[in-house]
């Protein structure tokens, strides 16, 4: 058993049929010595008396808010949560496996630049009685500070018969140099509590590997005289690291109709303009990627050909 | 500790082309190592990230773009002094700081070159003959060093009398390639910045 936060404790249980469970001793936070009784949750049934209560925690029925009283007055609470371990593996029931970029990916993180700010998100089908707490650091043995905000519900989607909820959090490394060469990864730890179930999820990454620039901005078309070609120009996104001559991007320019199966014109360039062939009912799209370290491409920025 | 704006004329910076070749060569070599050593811990997640130039050179700090010198987090540099002459410099416009940057890059290349050559000598003794260093990568390191053209003491190639542990050597190769790729990215960024300034 360990303390998650004040008056909240996590009991780690090997989860299998007829498991013996864990013996837990609760102590009432009071100077009083006698006349103390214990109850669980809203029940008025007295579980025991005395300053300490010894319980055998085997299942979710044994978890919950234990309260010690004296003469009708509440003295203190202890909330017990369960963390299940099945076949030596901690349970991952609360979050959905996003399977990208590999199986058992519960947390996904992205950074728009090298400033040390990044966003992580996760998915669940659970809608109520759910709380998250996020901690982060650079390295684990001698951790350097990363400050994370509160996790918030950022999107809801319908997937078949199920509703899916996306939560996200923003974090900022306390003293980040955009030009630094990372040797220690960022560690992100998410504590998830659903009713009386506790789970924790972790992700480890270098900022350079989770870079995904914002789409290029200010796409403009200029038809070329006596030609079916158009010159398309754009600018670096505002959120990208500066100076741009140091943090350079490369671009992919594509002309395509509405369907992905349609024919297309595609060209890669390090410049902020390109010449392509425009077709009726097609769109010109441009996306960006770090020129020197190939992490993710940005989303497309698009303008219609006409 | 940072790069001044007074730098060579655009498009006239001979090291840019070499640095692009360097990044390409080390990326290809790393990819080859990952594929060939698929049963060894050779991915970014599996290896320890070591920097053989740590406390010996200060490339990131010495080559910091002017715009980032206002960032306190970028300035906790280790002071190091280097020899200053080099053919990548348009000498009239060159300042001491830029020379410091380029000589730091030269020292990095020299240290990696020695490590790679020592390692290749060991790998050539491996009866499995599983992986060797790409001669193109070694040639590209050499070309960039020649373009930088700094005078510095020759670092003797390490020779070892004991029987090499090929497993450890291959893991060390992965560690070295990952670190060198990250340094090659920095070098490419620096050359691009200098070329544009």
């Amino acid at each position: 058993i360990w303390e998650l936060k004040k008056d909240v404790y996590v009991v780690e249980l090997d989860w299998y049929p007829d498991a013996p469970g864990e013996m837990v001793v609760l102590t009432c936070d009071t100077p009083e010595e006698d006349g103390i009784t214990w109850t669980l949750d809203q029940s008025s049934e007295v579980l025991g008396s005395g300053k300490t209560l010894t319980i055998q925690v085997k299942e979710f029925g044994d978890a919950g808010q234990y309260t010690c009283h004296k003469g009708g007055e509440v003295l203190s609470h202890s909330l017990l949560l369960l963390h299940k371990k099945e076949d030596g593996i901690w349970s991952t029931d609360i979050l959905k496996d996003q399977k990208e970029p590999k199986n058992k990916t519960f947390l996904r993180c992205e950074a728009k630049n090298y400033s040390g700010r990044f966003t992580c998100w996760w998915l669940t089908t659970i809608s109520t009685d759910l709380t998250f707490s996020v901690k982060s650091s650079r390295g684990s043995s001698d951790p350097q500070g990363v400050t994370c905000g509160a996790a918030t519900l950022s999107a809801e989607r319908v997937r078949g018969d199920n509703k899916e909820y996306e939560y996200s959090v923003e974090c900022q490394e306390d003293s980040a140099c955009p030009a630094a060469e990372e040797s220690l990864p960022i560690e992100v730890m998410v504590d998830a509590v659903h009713k009386l179930k506790y789970e924790n999820y972790t992700s480890s990454f270098f900022i350079r590997d989770i870079i995904k620039p914002d789409p290029p901005k200010n796409l403009q078309l200029k038809p070329l005289k006596n030609s079916r070609q158009v010159e398309v120009s754009w600018e670096y996104p505002d959120t990208w690291s500066t100076p741009h001559s140091y943090f350079s991007l490369t671009f992919c320019v594509q002309v395509q109709g509405k369907s992905k199966r349609e024919k297309k014109d595609r060209v890669f360039t390090d410049k902020t303009s390109a010449t392509v062939i425009c077709r009726k009912n097609a769109s010109i799209s441009v996306r960006a990627q770090d020129r020197y370290y190939s992490s993710s491409w940005s989303e497309w920025a698009s303008v219609p050909c006409s | 500790r940072n790069l001044p704006v007074a730098t060579p004329d655009p498009g006239m910076f001979p090291c840019l082309h070499h640095s692009q070749n360097l990044l390409r060569a080390v990326s290809n070599m790393l990819q080859k190592a990952r594929q060939t050593l698929e049963f060894y811990p050779c991915t970014s997640e599996e290896i320890d990230h070591e920097d053989i130039t740590k406390d010996k050179t200060s490339t990131v700090e010495a080559c910091l773009p002017l715009e980032l010198t206002k960032n306190e987090s970028c300035l906790n540099s280790r002071e190091t002094s280097f020899i200053t002459n080099g053919s990548c410099l348009a000498s009239r416009k060159t300042s001491f700081m830029m020379a410091l940057c380029l000589s730091s890059i030269y020292e990095d290349l020299k240290m990696y070159q020695v490590e790679f050559k020592t390692m290749n000598a060991k790998l050539l003794m491996d009866p499995k003959r599983q992986i060797f260093l790409d001669q193109n990568m070694l040639a590209v390191i050499d070309e960039l060093m020649q373009a930088l053209n700094f005078n510095s003491e020759t670092v003797p190639q390490k020779s070892s009398l004991e029987e090499p542990d090929f497993y450890k050597t291959k893991i060390k190769l992965c560690i070295l390639l990952h670190a060198f790729r990250i340094r090659a990215v920095t070098i490419d960024r620096v050359m691009s910045y200098l070329n544009a300034s």
């Epitope: 079916r228 024919k263 060209v267 890669f268 360039t269 010449t275 077709r279 | -």
Partner: antibody
């Protein structure tokens, strides 16, 4: 299976014109760009131009501008390349080729040898 | 027009050995570079798109690298069926242009 079948070999006199055909099968004809590329004996490949069969848009290499005409007939899934004012240096194998991507080629015809000789 | 220059023009290789062919563009073309193989009396066949993207159905021994002006096609271990002429093509701008070809011959 996508296939491009070209018309047979031709022998032409200098100053005359030649029209080579290329019939496509497999896949929708207008879903692809069609290119014409030639190869003189023992030489490399030389791109001549492309056509978008969907709308008839064309683009020609400056070297052939004014001498080459590329057309397409959607009803028969056939593309044509006509080269006029032939000279001996036009002796080559002419390939039609196609792709959904405009700027490179994934399927080639078998080639048509055009010999220009007096 | 962008001029594509291949080297060497002829490359004698022992079967089973690796081979590397170089292609250089007269100006920077990013990764807009494609590789083809051609055997005598046959039409070309696509091997690599955009400098390094493999094409389905092409053996994994063929790989491409490069960007800007310098590109390389590598065949990791030459098989008897690989003895042919290899050509690069730029797609950075029209007109599309090809390298003159490199003939890989049996040593």
């Amino acid at each position: 299976q996508v296939q491009l079948v070209q018309s047979g070999a031709e022998v032409k006199k200098p100053g005359s014109s030649v029209k080579v055909s290329c019939k496509a099968s497999g896949g929708t004809f207008s879903d692809y760009y069609l290119h014409w590329v030639r190869q003189a004996p023992g030489q490399g490949l030389e791109w001549m131009g492309w056509i978008d069969p969907e709308n008839g848009d064309t683009e020609y290499a400056p070297k052939f501008q004014g001498r080459v005409t590329i057309t397409a007939d959607e009803s028969t899934s056939t593309a044509y390349m006509e080269l006029s004012s032939l000279r001996s240096e036009d002796t080559a194998v002419y390939y039609c080729a196609r792709n959904k991507e405009l700027r490179y080629i994934d399927v080639w015809g078998q080639g048509t040898l055009v010999t220009v000789s007096s | 027009d962008i001029v594509m220059t291949q080297s060497p023009l002829s490359l004698p290789v022992t079967p089973g050995e690796p081979a590397s062919i170089s292609c250089r563009a007269s100006q920077s073309i990013s990764i807009n570079l494609h590789w083809y193989q051609q055997k005598p009396g046959q039409a070309p066949r696509q091997l690599i798109a955009f400098a390094s993207q493999s094409i389905s159905g092409v053996p994994s021994r063929f790989s491409g690298s490069g960007s800007g002006t310098d590109f390389t096609l590598t065949i990791s271990s030459l098989q008897p069926e690989d003895f042919a002429t290899y050509m690069c093509q730029q797609s950075n701008s029209f007109p599309l242009t090809f390298g003159q070809g490199t003939k890989v011959e049996i040593k």
